[in-house]
């Protein structure tokens, strides 16, 4: 049903859903801090623009009695329950920030008349693609897929002269929310990734993965998995690995690889890590000081959600336009705004664009080094290290199929 919005006469409210089930196990207090820091910045920016208005956030807490798993598995109804709570209280703001779980976002989008914008720190799954009033501030699965297909096809770099068309995907069901949906997208038979590959098999058991590492009859040399180095070590340990195996470790929200004193463990030598380019000022910022690298990105997305709302509010107010309109609800896309840590770009569908970074372990220095970067906004690769000190033969990535001749 239509809910009146607290969104006019110089007073603009943001509804922040504080759900018990979340993409990342982050104390809600930290998210509140991030939102409040964002509000301070927005107020300052609006004041500097000569706009004398009030911007506040209302935090809507779930009762947590029914939906208490803490992860996203029971989030489907929690989001709707919170919306019902908002509806009953007649306390809808100009914009809804949260939820972060794909299940809840999808259901909320499906079951409500969204005449207001929804901003999500998460909602990684393909089912949340192309939603007209949904904005996602953490890289969704679609962006990962486009990178992987682009990289698989590449055969014109001195370190990658073979196009790939095959892959194993390791997915055992214990993944974090982001990894779950990233791997889900790769597994889906109708996805772009599956469409572009000639062979793809999902490995669901630890033993399956371990066996492939030395199996002479394997159908692909490439294995995609998602998680951190420790996750890989638990699975792989110090087992021998065939020399032409390449493991692609998707670990987007982890900037530990860029820290000065980090040395890559030996088990990472056959691994390319896909992560996001780290922010400049985040490490010392007040809201992120006590957060782990992953949670920093999650809290940052909440903060940037507030800044995005401030950006749009400023534009509409300066143009004398109404905020409680479909035009406003559909405006949170195809733009760049000033985020907490520099410019943030949203694509035509309201999904954040970013610079993905592919790292390798230098056999000389045992450090993580940047191999290439990939701009998701223009789907373009930027080579960085043209002569990487790889573990693989001739400092080139191997063919994806053992024994196949030169291409």
């Amino acid at each position: 049903s239509q809910v009146s919005q607290n969104c006019h006469n110089g007073s603009y409210e943001i509804s922040v859903l504080m759900m018990g089930n979340s993409a990342f196990a982050e104390p809600l207090k930290n998210l509140e801090d991030a939102v409040n820091e964002g509000l301070e910045i927005v107020r300052g920016r609006l004041q500097n623009a000569g706009l004398n208005v009030t911007v506040n956030a209302t935090f809507m807490y779930s009762d947590g009695l029914i939906h208490n798993s803490g992860d996203c598995r029971s989030s489907t109804c929690e989001g709707l329950d919170l919306l019902r709570k908002i509806s009953n209280a007649q306390r809808m703001g100009c914009v809804l920030i949260g939820p972060s779980c794909t299940y809840s976002t999808f259901q909320m989008y499906l079951d409500t008349e969204l005449s207001y914008p929804m901003i999500s720190a998460g909602s990684f799954g393909l089912s949340c693609d192309y939603k007209e009033t949904l904005t996602r501030l953490m890289s969704p699965a679609r962006k990962l897929m486009y990178f992987l297909v682009n990289f698989w096809k590449t055969n014109d770099l001195p370190f990658k002269t073979y196009s790939w068309s095959t892959s194993y995907v390791y997915k055992n069901g214990t993944e974090t929310e982001d990894c779950f949906w990233y791997l889900n997208a790769l597994e889906a038979s109708v996805s772009y990734f599956s469409h572009e590959l000639g062979f793809k098999v999902v490995l669901r058991q630890d033993k399956e993965f371990q066996d492939i590492l030395m199996d002479h009859n394997r159908k692909s040399n490439v294995i995609i998995m998602c998680g951190g180095p420790e996750f890989l070590y638990k699975l792989k340990g110090d087992r021998a690995v065939a020399e032409d195996i390449v493991i692609i470790l998707v670990d987007l929200f982890n900037d530990q690889y860029f820290e000065d004193n980090v040395t890559a463990p030996d088990y990472m030598k056959n691994v390319l890590v896909l992560t996001l380019s780290p922010g400049n000022s985040l490490l010392n910022s007040s809201f992120s000081r006590n957060l782990s690298p992953t949670k920093r990105d999650f809290a940052l997305a909440y903060l940037n959600g507030i800044l995005l709302f401030g950006h749009m509010l400023k534009i509409f107010l300066e143009n004398g336009e109404n905020i409680t309109t479909p035009k406003f609800a559909h405006a949170f896309r195809n733009l760049t705004f000033e985020g907490y840590d520099g410019p943030v770009t949203l694509d035509d569908w309201g999904d954040v664009d970013s610079t993905m970074v592919l790292l390798y372990t230098s056999v000389d220095t045992k450090k993580y080094k940047v191999l290439l970067t990939y701009d998701t906004h223009v789907n373009k690769t930027y080579p960085v290290d043209m002569s990487p000190t790889f573990t693989w033969k001739n400092s080139k990535l191997p063919n994806d199929i053992t024994g196949r001749g030169p291409q």
Partner: antibody, heavy 118, light 106 residues
């Protein structure tokens, strides 16, 4: 418009060093690798090395590893190449060239002539 | 390092002629790149990834080939095409250039 403007011609004595600059404009300097290429009189083009201005990664052609040192100043959008222990065979035109993968070396500087003569 | 051998080294032709320049690699490469250089000027990117014309290059130019043999073809030579053409590979590190083919007016 993309432009790479190199420093002027240099005449040096054997044993000396020279530092050639290449100022980039018309694009984001840190987005693209910068290559250096040598063209000695009557010789083919020779690739010397490449630098990624964003991460500072540098790859040298083994042949020039002890001859050339590539650096950059990102705030000035400028790449540099220093040649040490100059000898007569270092007499050449030196070019900087932007890498715009997949179109390698898509823009070139105008070249800097280095003459080594006693 | 991969050696690139261009032939011919010199080529005399008249405007309107069809001209073909060959580049042979000492081992197989996936793609070839071509540059044009005029006297007193720096090289210009001309053809990349074997057959893609760089920005501003006339459509009378074309590139083809695979493996170790690549060609640059000018379908109808124009006065402004008289220059030296270099092939280049980046399949293996380091990138290497051919010795050049000088196209002169007959």
């Amino acid at each position: 418009e993309v432009q790479l403007v190199q420093s002027g011609a240099e005449v040096k004595k054997p044993g000396a060093s020279v530092k050639v600059s290449c100022k980039a404009s018309g694009y984001t300097f840190t987005d693209h690798n910068m290559n250096w290429v040598k063209q000695a009189p009557g010789q083919r083009l020779e690739w010397m090395g490449v630098m990624n201005p964003k991460f500072g990664t540098i790859n040298y052609n083994q042949k020039f590893k002890d001859k050339a040192t590539i650096t950059r100043d990102t705030s000035a959008s400028t790449a540099y190449m220093e040649l040490s222990s100059l000898r007569s065979e270092d007499t050449a035109v030196y070019y900087c060239a932007r890498d715009n993968y997949p179109n390698y070396f898509d823009y070139w500087g105008q070249g800097t002539t280095v003459t080594v003569s006693s | 390092d991969i050696q690139l051998t261009q032939s011919p080294s010199f080529l005399s032709a008249s405007p309107g002629d069809r001209v073909t320049i060959t580049c042979s690699a000492s081992s197989s490469v996936n793609y070839m790149y071509w540059y044009q250089q005029k006297p007193g000027s720096s090289p210009k990117s001309w053809i990349y990834r074997t057959q893609n014309l760089a920005s501003g290059v006339p459509s009378r130019f074309s590139g083809s080939g695979s493996g170790t043999e690549y060609t640059l073809t000018i379908s109808s030579l124009q006065p402004e095409d008289f220059a030296t053409y270099y092939c280049q590979q980046y399949h293996d590190y380091p990138p290497t250039f051919g010795g050049g083919t000088k196209v002169e007016i007959k």
